[in-house]
Amino acid sequence: SGLNDIFEAQKIEWHELPRWRQQWSGSGTTSRFPETVLARCVKYTEVHPEMRHVDCQSVWDAFKGAFISKYPCNITEEDYQPLVKLGTQTVPCNKTLLWSRIKDLAHQFTQVQRDMFTLEDMLLGYLADDLTWCGEFNTFEINYQSCPDWRKDCSNNPVSVFWKTVSRRFAETACGVVHVMLNGSRSKIFDKNSTFGSVEVHNLQPEKVQALEAWVIHGGREDSRDLCQDPTIKELESIISKRNIRFFCKNIYRPDKFLQCVKNPEDSSCLSGI
């Protein structure tokens, strides 16, 4: 980006830039960020008994240590390793649900199907879900005014690197049959540039993952097309098959009925297709 070019060309240190330079294109850190992370950690460890040994103050310290005082366009996955270590957690085989561009439905599903887990149902994903954060180089301050935008400023920003790091780890630890929910209303049902397409797909371990099953969620009520035949789904199938992982695909024509049938599987209307 332009700011990085200035940085490189002039060989100046970040802290020598005037204060007004530290303006980014993205929104600033979510208000009450430290309090929110700490409260979420306490609540999570409360309801997930196997995580009750976790010291939430240490989690916050590790989270803070990943980005505070660091140039917010030069964050690395290494910066998050202390946090990742503290948040180590495993998902039972066959219980991992990945998603791409359809977060709300994926989360509604795991809120009902309590034995399946998205990344945001794990401690680290739960802590950071829907939050933004960044610091400032050489100060201990959190920047509540602005943070780097992935497109306009830089990709190695605190939020993007966090999600890349934890998504990689989540995919690496998955086993059995892994499910992914995809948005059938988008032009690219499978997008190679999404976190799923660029990180998770490539970090599923063939020696542990037998199959990837895609659930393509239809948007229109009258949409009866077989979206499993979409070219981007075929592309996903090719990528997965080359990695020696079997691929399956299902159309979910009625997401509302799908959720209702997860809630009440004995309902007679659930015996027909969804």
Partner: antibody, heavy 121, light 110 residues
Framework: QSLEESGGDLVKPGASLTLTCTAS?????????ICWVRQAPGKGLEWIAC???????TYYASWAKGRFTISKTSSTTVTLQMTSLTAADTATYFC???????????????WGPGTLVTVSS | AQVLTQTPSPVSAAVGGTVTINCQAS????????LAWFQQKPGQPPKLLIY???TLASGVPSRFKGSGSGTQFTLTISEVQSDDAATYYC??????????FGGGTEVVVK
């Protein structure tokens, strides 16, 4: 260590009622979960809600959200507020504790004797 | 949405015999083993028998045995005594602070 419920009564449909659970011989530690479970006459047990003593975070059965409110009022008391009562809410209401210590997690090891709520016109 | 189905009900047993009660969960319980068994007699609150699927609660006779994992659990009462006549409930814990009870199984001792 014991729990005891109070506040059960005969009320008319549409009425509200508050039940109280009181701990004797101990106070709720920060990790202690205090919960309410009910049992309609001749029927099975039904979980309603829990509150965590240390954080006052609350957890409800999906059917109980909105009409039932669980609150911690002191280090030894928890209440359950019930609104818009119907005949279907007629039951014995039990207070139960999930200690959340060591391996004691996810089940109720301490129960009160129960208090009867009757909703009838 | 978290449904625990107990079978059979009622079940009858002769003194000295064996009773087996099944509890099937519609979803895997937390950690595959967060399941407890309770005994309840008329006019009394439930009494904890088994927790963590197979651990015997304090003071409970070893005639009571819990087994199972994930979605299928069993309570076995061997050498049944007349005092074992009661209703038995399974209770599960799920991720997110959710508890659920089975519908109960009445044990009649002949």
């Amino acid at each position: 260590q014991s729990l005891e419920e109070s506040g059960g009564d005969l009320v008319k449909p549409g009425a509200s009622l508050t039940l109280t659970c009181t701990a004797s011989g101990f106070s709720f530690s920060s990790r202690y979960w205090i919960c309410w479970v009910r049992q309609a006459p001749g029927k099975g047990l039904e979980w309603i809600a829990c509150i965590v003593a240390g954080t006052t975070n609350t957890y409800y059965a999906s059917w109980a959200k909105g009409r039932f409110t669980i609150s911690k009022t002191s280090s030894t008391t928890v209440t359950l507020q019930m609104t818009s009562l119907t005949a279907a809410d007629t039951a014995t209401y039990f207070c139960a504790g999930d200690p959340r210590t060591g391996s004691n997690v996810g089940y109720f090891n301490l129960w009160g004797p129960g208090t009867l709520v009757t909703v009838s016109s | 949405a978290q449904v625990l189905t107990q079978t059979p009900s009622p079940v009858s047993a002769a003194v000295g015999g064996t009773v087996t009660i099944n509890c099937q969960a519609s979803q895997s319980v937390y950690n595959n083993n967060y399941l407890a068994w309770f005994q309840q007699k008329p006019g009394q609150p439930p009494k904890l028998l088994i927790y963590s699927a197979s651990t015997l609660a304090s003071g409970v006779p070893s005639r009571f045995k819990g087994s199972g994992s994930g979605t299928q659990f069993t309570l076995t009462i061997s050498e049944v005594q007349s005092d074992d006549a009661a209703t038995y409930y399974c209770q599960a814990y799920y991720s997110g602070g959710i508890y659920a009870f089975g519908g109960g199984t009445e044990v009649v001792v002949k």
